[in-house]
């Protein structure tokens, strides 16, 4: 493929590989992709240090690179037609494997705006200077190259492969050689963490003449989030060396028997795990690492812990302390939401009360219901409110419009309703006549 020497660093749940070869960004991405990865992300200072470590490993193996200022592709690219955005840390570029924009960046210089062609990012290494953790490789953007024409000073690329988990390297208790074959087709005899689904071939002995045993193991998930080889006890043990070779392959203590045999042991506060080599803290929660209201939860076999928050709280960035969740951001209420410590409260607008289908729902208050009507006479319920009405001969009165006041028909706007005398009554009126006159059948005229 044109990609030669490689170096590998595995840490956390990812492995980084560095390759030398004058390839275009597309060819480099294709190379990473074929083995199940992508061109590397550099999403934090820590990740930049991992990438720097793998590049340093590669440079130690490479005799001489052609350019003093060498460039290595990473997975940061900007598609044609997508313009520069100076307000963002990634300036409008995005990681080839997807994922959100990240706050970390380490640009070499101010970027020029150009939307007419695809742009790709490489790490700029000054080979005249030693690679120091304090001086992380700068990001350089430029054309992405094409087959046979990778671009000036392009010397290689860095891939990243992510895994469910990692196994500890196998412990040898005597002379031998371990060869790890990773899922991304790299072989190595020195990995500080070995990715899930890797194979380990162990050849015991000091040379061909001595070689007596060989073992084959796979890094597998033995229980949820517990990754192990399934080997039991140190490998390649030899009475000739006892505990003197690599501490017998033991994680902490090695105890020799008189017959050249030995056993692994653990310091106070630790216990020996099923592999009979590794020691784990008896109870990582005993040091009370979780703060505030967080509870310490042990992982399987007491190997690790996480902090867990009570309902309504979530872990902060330290993963050790709890902060209140603002449940109101998810709009759980039909009308008003009030965030409270550890929870929230739904409230209803005036004229509504809690109820109806679904949590946090509000239903109209029937202000006109029997026994609660605020109106002196007629009451009509409306959505979220109500209105009062009055019987004939009365008009709405009062500041809140709930009272009914008698209409004085005798002084009505249409003038006198009676020909002679007018008597106002509650809600009505009647006419009368002067002495010697009689009220006519129409109840208005006097005859």
């Amino acid at each position: 493929t044109g990609a030669d020497t490689e170096a590998v660093v595995c840490v956390g749940t990812a492995c980084y590989t560095a390759h030398s070869g004058k390839l275009s960004a597309a060819e480099a991405q294709n190379h990473c992709n074929q083995n199940g990865g992508n061109l590397a992300t550099v999403k934090s200072k820590e990740e930049a240090q991992h990438v720097q470590r793998v590049l340093a490993q590669l440079l130690r193996r490479e005799a001489a690179l052609t350019a003093r200022m060498s460039k290595f592709w990473i997975g940061l690219q900007r598609e044609k037609g997508k313009c520069l955005d100076p307000s963002l840390p990634l300036k409008g570029f995005s990681w080839v494997g997807g994922g959100e924009d990240t706050p970390y960046s380490n640009w070499h210089k101010e970027l020029r705006n150009s939307c007419i062609s695809k742009r790709c990012v490489s790490l700029l290494l000054d080979l005249s200077q030693p690679l120091l953790p304090s001086r992380l490789p700068k990001w350089s953007e430029g054309p992405c190259g094409s087959p046979g024409s990778p671009g000036s000073n392009i010397e290689g690329f860095v891939c990243k492969f992510s895994f469910k988990g990692m196994c500890r390297p196998l412990a040898l208790g005597g002379p031998g050689q371990v060869t790890y074959t990773t899922p991304f087709q790299t072989t190595s005899s020195s990995l500080e963490a070995v990715p899930f689904a890797s194979a380990a071939n162990v050849a015991c002995g000091e040379g061909d003449k001595d070689e007596t045993q060989s073992h084959y193991f796979l890094c597998k998930e033995k229980a949820p989030d517990v990754f192990d080889w399934g080997s039991s006890g140190p490998l390649c043990v030899s009475p000739k060396y006892g505990c003197n070779f690599n501490n017998g392959g033991c994680h902490q203590d090695c105890f020799e028997g008189g017959d050249g045999s030995f056993l692994c042991g653990c310091r106070p506060g630790f216990r020996l795990l099923d592999d009979l080599v590794t020691c784990a803290s008896r109870n990582p929660c005993s040091s009370s690492p979780c703060r505030g209201g967080a509870t310490c939860v042990l992982g399987p076999h007491g190997k690790n812990y996480t902090c867990r928050c009570p309902q309504g709280y979530q872990l902060d960035s330290s993963q050790l302390d709890c902060v209140d969740v603002d449940e109101c951001q998810d709009s759980p209420c039909a009308q008003e939401c009030v965030n409270t410590p550890g929870g929230f409260r739904c409230e209803c607008w005036v004229g509504y009360e809690p109820g109806g289908p679904g949590e946090g729902a509000c239903q109209d208050v029937d202000e006109c219901a029997l026994g609660r009507s605020p109106c002196a006479q007629g009451c009509t319920n409306t959505d979220g409110s109500f209105h009062c009405s009055c019987e004939e001969g009365y008009v709405l009165a009062g500041e809140d419009g709930t009272q009914c006041q008698d209409v004085d028909e005798c002084v009505g706007p249409g003038g006198p309703l009676c020909d002679s005398l007018c008597f106002n009554t509650q809600g009505s009126f009647h006419c009368g006549c002067l002495p010697g006159w009689v009220l006519a059948p129409n109840g208005v005229s006097c005859t």
């Epitope: 194979a199 084959y216 193991f217 796979l218 597998k220 033995k222 229980a223 949820p224 989030d225 080889w229 399934g230 939860v297 042990l298 992982g299 399987p300 076999h301 690790n304 812990y305 996480t306």
Partner: antibody
Framework: QVQLVQSGAEVKKPGSSVKVSCKAS????????LNWVRQAPGQGLEWFGR????????DYNGKFKGRVTLTADKSTSTAYMELSSLRSEDTAVYFC???????????WGQGTTVTVSS | DIVMTQSPLSLPVTPGEPASISCRFS???????????LYWYLQKPGQSPQLLIY???NLASGVPDRFSGSGSGTDFTLKISRVEAEDVGVYYC?????????FGGGTKLEIK
């Protein structure tokens, strides 16, 4: 589709051994744990061991350690369970079961009845 | 070993009615990764067991949605919203958090 086909019923004398086979098909045999579960007549389910065919790694229920041996032949995608020093209480139906990526036992063999009787 | 107690031992149900089975564990099945490693299996008469629910609340492929699982770290419930005749059999809860994997004693669901 995933299938686990077990060998036929066995009748054994106390103190003898029995070897039950389980032929897998329809999935990558080497990459999944294969569990063995037994069920005594009218009783519940009891897990007694598992094997990872990829490298032959095994785990056993402490209750049976020393009497049970699990093996796998990758070339024929067949797993074997051998139980020695049989006693009458080993009379049960023995199931081979695939363990999936969610730690569930998702595919079960049809079961092999082993009867231990003098 | 993680020990579990399943109840009831027997559960007679009228078709169309809901049913509920409980399972209590001697220690929490909640892993530090936030997943609860609790499983439910059904063994129909004369058949091998079949997976119903994985990781406490996820329905296995092909299982009708009248089945549901819920619970906390140590107490779990399998619910059937409306029992059908085909649901008869023995229901087992199980844990796959720590070796040895263990099963509950079983609950026999029968039609009234």
């Amino acid at each position: 589709q995933v299938q686990l086909v077990q060998s036929g019923a066995e009748v054994k004398k106390p103190g003898s051994s029995v070897k039950v086979s389980c032929k897998a098909s329809g999935y990558a045999f080497s990459s999944y744990w294969l569990n063995w579960v037994r069920q005594a007549p009218g009783q519940g389910l009891e897990w007694f061991g598992r094997i990872y065919p990829g490298d032959g790694d095994t785990d056993y229920n402490g209750k049976f350690k020393g009497r049970v041996t699990l093996t796998a032949d990758k070339s024929t995608s067949t797993a074997y369970m051998e139980l020695s020093s049989l006693r009458s209480e080993d009379t049960a139906v023995y199931f081979c079961v695939r363990g999936d990526g969610y730690w569930a036992m998702d595919y079960w063999g049809q079961g092999t009845t082993v009867t231990v009787s003098s | 070993d993680i020990v579990m107690t399943q109840s009831p031992l027997s559960l007679p149900v009228t078709p169309g009615e809901p049913a509920s089975i409980s399972c209590r564990f001697s220690q929490s099945l909640l892993h530090s990764n936030g997943i609860t490693y609790l499983y439910w299996y059904l063994q129909k008469p004369g058949q091998s067991p079949q997976l119903l629910i994985y990781q406490m609340s996820n329905l296995a492929s092909g299982v009708p949605d009248r089945f549901s699982g819920s619970g906390s770290g140590t107490d779990f419930t399998l619910k059937i919203s409306r029992v059908e005749a085909e649901d008869v059999g023995v229901y087992y809860c199980a844990q796959n958090l720590e070796l040895p994997w263990t099963f509950g004693g079983g609950t026999k669901l029968e039609i009234k």
